[in-house]
């Protein structure tokens, strides 16, 4: 019987963010089918008239793919049979941001789910002691951010202290004219303390910690994507 006679199947997506110039994943899962040839995956983007990607009869079907996605998309073909319709997006562009729809047809039925995809740039900060400075100074550097983030310094000893008066942050446009290098300098640093350089925009939050003692310097950094939700 035809598609119209089938019931709906559950399709699940997860909002995510893509790092400009790198590869990204648009996550989508569905109730699996026993026959690969019965599965159709279509990825669509709001406002884009061609398809983002289509997979049917066990292979890519890209004749109706929109030009903006040419040569940049792939599904995990070997995982489709177990219900993975996630899309790999190569060389993420700023313009890839938007609302995507993961649309699935199987012998059991059809279903779809939307996904919000944000794009920007985010990178781990590295905090170092600036030995060239006249006083004890820390330098926090992160190579690629977009949109322009905020930078806040914190310290373990002086919790809640405002370091804006004793820090200086600059943003330097990178060669591709979109992303920027973030450099923040913290002056009047005291020894036996842990300082944190926190960089944040609406896509990601990254922290670089440095612990400075008489005998050693310890560093740690981590990055977290914001607003990732099912």
């Amino acid at each position: 019987f035809g598609i119209s006679g089938r019931h709906s199947i559950t399709v699940t997506t997860v909002a995510s963010a893509g790092n400009i110039g790198e590869d990204g994943i648009l996550s989508c899962t569905f109730e699996p089918d026993i026959k690969l040839s019965d599965i159709v995956i279509q990825w669509l983007k709001e406002g884009v008239l061609g398809l983002v990607h289509e997979f049917k009869e066990g292979k890519d079907e890209l004749s109706e793919q929109d030009e903006m996605f040419r040569g940049r998309t792939a599904v995990f073909a070997d995982q489709v049979i177990v219900g993975n319709a996630s899309l790999r997006l190569k060389n993420v562009q700023l313009t890839d941001a938007g609302t995507y729809k993961c649309y699935i047809i199987t012998s059991k039925g059809k279903g779809n789910a939307n996904l919000e995809y944000k794009t920007g740039a985010f990178s781990m900060p590295e905090v170092n002691v600036d030995y060239n400075a006249s006083s004890e100074t820390l330098r926090c550097e992160a190579p690629r951010w977009f949109p322009q983030p905020t930078v806040v310094w914190a310290s373990q000893v002086d919790q809640g202290a405002n370091f804006s008066e004793v820090s200086n942050t600059s943003f330097e446009l990178n060669s591709e004219n979109v992303t920027m290098k973030v450099v923040s300098v913290l002056y009047n640093v005291t020894i036996n303390n842990t300082y944190s350089c926190m960089i944040e925009n609406d896509i990601a939050k990254a922290t670089g910690d440095i612990k400075v003692t008489e005998s050693e310097i310890k560093r740690r950094s981590h990055l977290q994507l914001l607003n990732s939700k099912a």
Epitope: G47, L49, L62, E67, R70, G71
Partner: antibody, heavy 116, light 107 residues
């Protein structure tokens, strides 16, 4: 059936502007791009650009950038192509065509003659 | 821009002949090529899309093949109504450029 009907022939003086219309029917107007292609007398086909009827976003051929403007009116399912600062080499038949990666159907064509 | 080089530019043939027109892209365009037929005073008409797919209503004597940079349009047995100009077009990357055309004339 799907149909694209273009406005009538135009005669313009060098330096003037021309605006050609293309009215779509028989399908969801916002579902596919509208392209413009021109053909000078006895010559081949030249891609001019396209418009997304949903968003109004456009892509133009480099050589026409700054002189060509494509717009749309979703209430009447019509797209427009305006070419300014006309010169004699702009004399051509101008076609609109619907599509994503291939063009089908095409309008009947509009002859624009640029002559002093 | 991607260049499309079509050959021959003109061709004389007889009814019943098998005719081949080729098109070469200046870079890999996968299978994003279309073929159109144009008769004098008329708009072009889509024959083949995505390199080898026959447009609805187009006679099966028309076929397309190729992938990457080299493509072919074949008319298996020429009919009187097939004498026209044929154009290839790439739709891999804007601008969607056309070949210069092949004029098919009666011998």
């Amino acid at each position: 059936q799907v149909q694209l009907v273009q406005s009538g022939a135009e005669v313009k003086k060098p330096g003037a502007s021309v605006k050609v219309s293309c009215k779509a029917s028989g399908y969801t107007f916002t579902a596919q791009y509208m392209y413009w292609v021109r053909q000078a007398p006895g010559q081949g086909l030249e891609w001019m650009g396209r418009i997304n009827p949903t968003s109004g976003n456009t892509v133009y051929a480099q050589k026409l950038q700054g002189r060509v403007t494509m717009t749309r009116d979703t209430s009447t399912s019509t797209v427009y192509m305006e070419l300014s600062s006309l010169r004699s080499e702009d004399t051509a038949v101008y076609y609109c065509a619907r599509g994503i990666n291939w063009f089908d159907p095409w309008g009947q064509g509009t002859l624009v003659t640029v002559s002093s | 821009d991607i260049q499309m080089t079509q050959s021959p530019s003109s061709l004389s043939a007889s009814v019943g002949d098998r005719v081949t027109i080729t098109c070469q892209a200046s870079q890999d365009i996968s299978n994003y090529i279309n073929w159109y037929q144009q008769k004098p005073g008329k708009a072009p008409k889509l024959l083949i899309y995505a390199a080898s797919r026959l447009q609805s209503g187009v006679p099966s004597r028309f076929s397309g093949s190729g992938s990457g940079t080299d493509f072919t349009l074949t008319i298996s047995s020429l009919q009187p109504e097939d004498f026209a100009t044929y154009y290839c077009q790439q739709s891999y990357r804007s601008p969607f450029t056309f070949g210069q055309g092949t004029k098919l004339e009666i011998k």
